[in-house]
């Protein structure tokens, strides 16, 4: 049948299951004259054969674990053996069957973990291999803890990453492990292939012994440091210690201060490096970090608290160059004229900022001195001797000494004598009627203008009008601004209106003066006005408590772990249903009722962090209005990616014969996070048998040189296996292959004597 099993010579790919005895031909190539025969080259392994007439077949069962892809070339030759078509690539992909069981690399593992280690941070890896294809379930391994001994209160202290075999503490383990109570644990770990999902999966088990060690990496007690210290700096104030020697300590200033006056030495001793100023900053919170030689954090940072103790280094300050008060002509003795409030930058509610007030001078001294007194501690000015007369003395100036326990400051007060306040404000109308507004009316909107008048002396506290809402607005949704020139009041919306809590509000305004009324005059009904505010319903969408919710987890958390939660409320009080939108990787699920977010698949920082999805809150019932917020999941790196080659290195060649040993440079990379100094790979040959012919030498953390050890190589392709280790915790290793061809060269390129019908030689790398 032309097409499926036979046809012209062209690049083709065939897939054949391993382990099956040959039952049919693979393909029948048809020759076009002058081609008369076919030749097969490449990775035939004496399994693949082509007959001269073009019949391609295999003669025994394939084994994917020996070779997963056979790269073959088929050429059509004329009667003289000259290539007239091709060679074309024929790829045989060997499909996997589950014919290998997973096996742990060790029957017993031993490890140790410090108490209070970060939950989810791996301290030990178990590793199993399965020769089957990891891209199929046959080779997908699933790790599980079968048993933890001892098991206290049925609580698991340890967890394993199903995918990577990374063992870490659970949150409970981080909090409760204590070497004084229980210094050792044993885990039985199983590994299954088929991703653990099939009854037909193969499995293996291993035993893990874990020692719990004490953690001395603890935050020190808060430190108190007196400001403006004159002692020689730096001064040691506290210390931290990592559990093992050799840690590199550093301090992290989360507040990003313009000057950060602390340092740490390589013993872990923490110093203040310069005098502190409490008035600039009264407390510092920063972090001590311990890192390994590669700059990777060894554990969580410790929070260091420094409180700056106050000294009396600030004098009192006046509120303004001159403070102005008004007093009415006939005001009675003892009446309050106003309060002078001076400030002191020293610590509140201490002797350093406790102030005393004293009048040191009055001008003019008419009709006498001592007309005013000031309360020593409160700073309240009172009329002391008699009523004042505006026509005799319209203005008095006082000099007031304000002192703390060490410093004195002079402040100046001007007191203006004004007419008596014997007229009350009178509203132009007592009822401003009804006003209907939708509950979503904008904040800041002016909804009503009110007006009262006062016949007292203009532009004094006796005639100035202040409007207050004294009834009907306990939530403070409304406010009144006064125009100081016209005494017009503008009623504005200060907070959102809400139909659900206040559909009708009966508002009462009061108009009053800042100055007290004279004895015998009182505010009456003329100084009050009312209006009715009617709020209409607008169905509002649920409201999230935050615009962006953020959570941080290690990328190797177990499936089903809670990674965060969101909250929203519906203004109408309806129930809310939560859902996710834009979970393109299928990593998360949300509890529709509680808003808790869980992982449902293995997370991968290398696929992108933070992982951003939208959370949707929808009213249940009603008009099903919804609103959207962002959930950002920050994934913290674990070392779960083995090194690999940074690019495709097919086409490497040396001209044959070698006149002198040669070398070539290659680059490695991996997808994990490399903070500070980048990767630190080490390189070695992948098998001992290569060492007679090749050597590999490290150039830097990412590049290495592959060199030939001699010149006696055959004219063919060599596949050199290189082992690359990332030195991570735990170290991961990748074995990569560099194909290197030794070939006859023409003008610096590989030559193969053959051509199309014209006979032009094929030249390539």
């Amino acid at each position: 049948q032309e097409g499926k099993f036979s046809g012209p010579l062209k690049p083709m790919t065939f897939s054949i299951y391993e382990g099956q005895e040959p039952s049919q031909i693979i393909f029948q190539f048809k020759a076009n004259p002058p081609a008369v025969t076919f030749e097969l080259t490449g990775e035939t392994d004496n399994i693949f054969v082509i007959e001269r007439e073009g019949l391609l077949y295999y003669n025994r069962a394939l084994d994917r674990e020996t070779r997963s892809t056979h790269n073959l070339q088929v050429a059509a030759l004329d009667a003289n053996g000259i290539i007239v078509e091709g060679p074309v690539p024929i790829t045989i992909k060997v499909k996997d069957i589950n014919d290998n069981r997973p096996t742990f690399l060790q029957s017993k593992y031993e490890g140790s973990v410090r108490q209070n280690s970060r939950p989810g941070k791996p301290f030990l890896y178990v590793n199993a291999t399965d020769l089957d294809d990891p891209a199929t379930p046959n080779g997908q391994l699933y790790y599980q803890i079968v048993i933890q001994l001892p098991m206290i209160n049925n609580v698991m202290y340890f967890q394993i990453n199903n995918k990577t075999g990374a063992i870490s503490l659970t949150r409970e383990g981080s909090q409760e492990l204590n070497p004084a109570k229980n210094p050792s644990y044993n885990l039985v770990i199983s590994v299954k292939d088929m991703g653990g999902q099939s009854e037909n999966s193969f499995s293996d088990t291993t035993s893990v012994d874990i020692i719990v060690t004490e953690n001395i990496w603890k935050a020190p007690k808060p430190v108190e440091m007196v400001e403006n210290s004159t002692d020689p700096h730096p001064i040691k104030i506290t210390q931290v210690r990592w559990n093992d020697p050799g840690a590199q300590y550093s301090l992290v200033d989360k507040e990003k201060l313009p000057r950060f006056p602390f340092s740490i030495d390589q013993e872990g001793d923490i110093y203040v490096t310069q005098p502190l100023d409490r008035e600039e900053k009264d407390a510092y919170v920063f972090y001590a970090v311990a890192k390994d030689e590669y700059g990777k954090p060894l554990s969580y940072p410790l929070e260091i608290h420094v409180k700056v103790k106050d000294i009396n280094d600030n004098p009192p300050t006046c509120p303004s160059p001159v403070t102005v008060f008004e007093v009415q002509e006939n005001e009675r003795l003892g009446n309050s004229i106003g309060t002078l409030t001076a400030h002191d930058r020293d610590e509140e509610n201490t002797a350093n900022s406790f102030l005393n007030y004293r009048i040191v001078e009055q001008t003019p001294k008419l009709p006498m001195d001592g007309l005013f007194l000031i309360q020593t501690y409160a700073g309240m000015l009172q009329l002391a001797k008699q009523s004042l007369k505006k026509q005799d003395t319209p203005q008095y100036n006082l000099t007031i000494e304000v002192s703390d326990k060490d410093f004195k400051t002079l402040c100046f007060v001007q007191i203006n004598v004004i007419d008596i306040n014997d007229q009350i404000p009178i509203f132009e109308k007592s009822d401003y009627g009804n006003l209907t507004l939708a509950e979503d009316t904008n904040i800041g909107s002016t909804i009503l203008t009110i007006q009262a008048t006062d016949a007292d002396e203009p532009f004094t506290g006796s005639s100035k009008i202040l409007y207050h809402i004294i009834k009907g607005d306990s939530e403070g949704r409304l406010g009144v601004d006064t125009d100081p020139h016209t005494n017009t009041g503008y009623v504005i919306i200060k907070k959102p209106l809400d139909f659900e809590t206040a559909a009708v509000s009966n508002i009462v305004f009061k108009a009053e003066n800042p100055e007290p009324l004279v004895f015998g005059v009182k505010y009456n009904a003329s100084s009050f006005a009312k209006f009715t505010l009617i709020v209409t319903d607008v169905n509002e969408a649920p409201q999230f408590s935050q615009h962006v919710f953020q959570a941080k987890v290690s990328e190797d958390v177990a499936i089903g772990t809670k990674v965060g939660n969101v909250t929203a409320k519906d203004p109408e009080g309806l129930d809310i249903s939560y859902s996710l939108r834009g979970d393109t990787r299928g990593w998360l699920k949300i509890d529709h009722v509680t808003g808790e977010i869980f992982s449902v698949a293995p997370l991968d920082r290398e696929a992108g962090s933070p992982y951003r999805v939208q959370v949707v809150a929808t009213e249940v019932g009603g008009s099903s209005l919804s609103s959207v917020s962002e959930f950002h999941l920050i994934l913290m790196d674990v070392n779960d990616n083995p090194p690999r080659l940074a690019k495709d290195y097919t086409g490497l060649f040396f001209c044959h014969p070698l006149s002198a040993p040669g070398s070539l440079i290659f680059e490695a990379t991996d997808d994990d996070q490399h903070l500070f100094r980048g990767p630190h790979f080490t390189f070695s040959l992948g098998s001992g048998s290569l060492q007679n012919d090749w050597e590999v030498s490290k150039i830097n953390g990412t590049h290495a040189r592959l060199s030939t050890r001699h010149t006696e190589f055959e004219e063919r392709e060599y596949v050199v296996l290189i082992r690359i280790n990332d030195g991570g915790r735990p170290p991961l290793e990748g074995i990569v292959s560099l194909p290197v061809t030794f070939c006859s060269c023409v003008e610096g390129s590989c030559f193969r004597p053959a051509g199309h019908q014209t006979g032009i030689p094929t030249v390539g790398m």
């Epitope: 030749e39 030559f751 004597p753 014209t758 006979g759």
Partner: antibody, heavy 123, light 107 residues
Framework: EVQLQQSVAELVKPGASVKMSCKVS????????IHWMKQRPEQGLEWIGY????????GYNEKFKGKATLTADTSSSTAYMQLNSLTSEDSAVYFC????????????????WGQGTTLTVSS | DIVMTQSQKFMSTTVGDRVNITCKAS??????VAWYQQKPGQSPKLLIY???NRYTGVPDRFTGSGSGTDFTLTITNMQSKDLADYFC?????????FGGGTKLEIK
Amino acid sequence: EVQLQQSVAELVKPGASVKMSCKVSGYTLTDHTIHWMKQRPEQGLEWIGYIYPRDGITGYNEKFKGKATLTADTSSSTAYMQLNSLTSEDSAVYFCARWGYSYRNYAYYYDYWGQGTTLTVSS
Amino acid sequence: DIVMTQSQKFMSTTVGDRVNITCKASQNVGTAVAWYQQKPGQSPKLLIYSASNRYTGVPDRFTGSGSGTDFTLTITNMQSKDLADYFCQQYSSYPWTFGGGTKLEIK
């Protein structure tokens, strides 16, 4: 022992045709191509073409198309070259040769030659 | 067509000499070149194939070298029985072509 035996000499008149033979022994004719070359006195060799006796496939030098016709008779293990419309320019020694090659070793060459047929075109 | 040029039609030599016979191709032929020896009244005999491989039974004083467009046949320790015509041939591209030949003579 592989041998290629050619007819020794041919004397023909201008305008006529001639068919010279190349009989092989020591191997099977159908296993290799037979090539024909022309050599004039004090001159180099010229490649005329080849025949693959197994299936009669032929390949010619463009210069000799219409002049030479290559055939083979497997039953007598003999290859033939017929030259027509002969002129004095066709007077030369004509060699047949076996093209032996090993694809695996990229080895290609004429490993056995006939002793040559001398063609004289004269009136 | 690819032209194979043997620039020296004749070369004078002495027994024991080292002789270099050159052949230049008009375009790149890789290593698809053979060398043949022809004595008067005889058919050609194969010496070298694939530019540098010595054919079975050929004395090791015959060496071929070169690739691309420039090729050399070297005879070290020249013998009197080596007096003959030497031809190069390319089989990279049809039509196959021969060089004009170089005849070795005694000085």
